[in-house]
């Protein structure tokens, strides 16, 4: 069955947008006007995972690209990466765990917790133009809250 997906953009709680930084990295920065066209459009797919009444498992692919955000250990540290996949097989309902994020809505803000590494979240830095990363702390300096903007297909 085709997996249910929607197209969207994400901004962190400081209103920074996410853009590509090289072929396999995202960075967060403030954009205005025509520059807003640079922000990445995600294809958010609803997938199987350890769903709860508060957490919805999703996979975050880059629209019309065979790239997905995934969480892996690098040098013993949970790390966010963009991973290339075979477009014939993705997205799928039963995504591998490294591709799955628990979408958590709190006070109209979204958090994306790694299914592979509980309590690690998609994060941005306070500073401009820094990479999007997987962070192990909430409520500190780094930003783990996002808003989602729907994009028509």
């Amino acid at each position: 069955a085709p997996v249910r997906s929607l197209n969207c953009t994400l901004r962190d709680s400081q209103q920074k947008s996410l853009v590509m930084s090289g072929p396999y990295e995202l960075k967060a920065l403030h954009l205005q006007g025509q520059d807003m066209e640079q922000q990445v459009v995600f294809s958010m797919s609803f997938v199987q995972g350890e769903e709860s009444n508060d957490k919805i498992p999703v996979a975050l692919g880059l629209k019309e690209k065979n790239l997905y955000l995934s969480c892996v250990l690098k040098d013993d540290k949970p790390t966010l990466q963009l991973e290339s996949v075979d477009p014939k097989n993705y997205p799928k309902k039963k995504m591998e765990k490294r591709f799955v994020f628990n979408k958590i809505e709190i006070n109209n803000k979204l958090e994306f917790e790694s299914a592979q590494f509980p309590n690690w979240y998609i994060s941005t830095s306070q500073a401009e133009n820094m990479p999007v990363f997987l962070g192990g702390t909430k409520g500190g300096q780094d930003i783990t809250d996002f808003t989602m903007q729907f994009v028509s297909s």
Epitope: A1, Q48, S52, D54, K94
Partner: antibody, heavy 122, light 107 residues
Framework: EVQLQESGPGLVKPSETLSLTCTVS????????VSWIRQPPGKGLEWLGL???????YYNSPLKSRLTISKDNSKSQVSLKLSSVTAADTAVYYC????????????????WGQGTLVTVSS | DIQMTQSPSSLSASVGDRVTITCQAS??????LNWYQQKPGKAPKLLIS???TLRPGVPSRFSGSGSGTDFTFTISSLQPEDFATYYC?????????FGQGTKLEIK
């Protein structure tokens, strides 16, 4: 060998809270989810909800406001509490282990307890 | 929620008969369909997972097929111990939902 055993009072008064315990062996509650299912006398099976290995819970909508599932990993016990019960909650209550195989069979239920009958009556 | 429509609700058959039960999902569930056998006073027992995978120790006279929305459960040659109630369960999305059950009785 995987085993699950439900226990609790067989009789509960209307408007009170039904409390059951599922004691498991042969697997770790920190690794596998456990579901609760019920079956009214002579009727079919109704899935109530589950608790995952990490402790998150999913409750089926019709019972969401009355149902609480919790666990104690160290005691290998999962508990179910259903508040404000009525005669319609009279059923055999089962707990069951989730298969929990990511990317293959995450949501299936492979092993069940023998069930415990709870009657709601004054 | 996904609705599971199971038929027939009851069935009379004789030892040695071939018996078929069907389950229809209200939306595509791929192969995420389990079949359970329940005898009176006992817990359901998983016979088949993922539409057609026979569980260890389950006799080969039991089989399952189908994908998407339409599924079939077959007992190729009924044995006396097979008279029971059978349920399908979709394990594709939460909440999990069961079919209404099929009571298999001796003719």
């Amino acid at each position: 060998e995987v085993q699950l055993q439900e226990s609790g009072p067989g009789l509960v008064k209307p408007s009170e809270t039904l409390s059951l315990t599922c004691t498991v062996s042969g697997f770790s509650l920190s690794e596998y989810g456990v579901s609760w299912i019920r079956q009214p006398p002579g009727k079919g099976l109704e899935w109530l909800g589950l608790i995952w290995g990490g402790g998150d819970t999913y409750y089926n909508s019709p019972l969401k406001s009355r149902l609480t599932i919790s666990k104690d990993n160290s005691k290998s016990q999962v508990s179910l509490k259903l508040s404000s019960v009525t005669a319609a909650d009279t059923a055999v209550y089962y707990c069951a282990k989730q298969t929990n195989v990511w990317g293959y069979d995450l949501y299936g239920m492979d092993y069940w307890g023998q069930g415990t009958l709870v009657t709601v009556s004054s | 929620d996904i609705q599971m429509t199971q038929s027939p609700s009851s069935l009379s058959a004789s030892v040695g008969d071939r018996v078929t039960i069907t389950c229809q999902a209200s939306q595509d569930i791929d192969d995420d369909l389990n079949w359970y056998q329940q005898k009176p006073g006992k817990a359901p027992k998983l016979l088949i997972s993922l539409a057609n995978t026979l569980r260890p120790g389950v006799p080969s006279r039991f089989s399952g097929s189908g994908s998407g929305t339409d599924f079939t459960f077959t007992i190729s040659s009924l044995q006396p111990e097979d008279f029971a109630t059978y349920y399908c369960l979709q394990s594709s999305w939460l909440p999990l939902t069961f079919g209404q059950g099929t009571k298999l009785e001796i003719k």
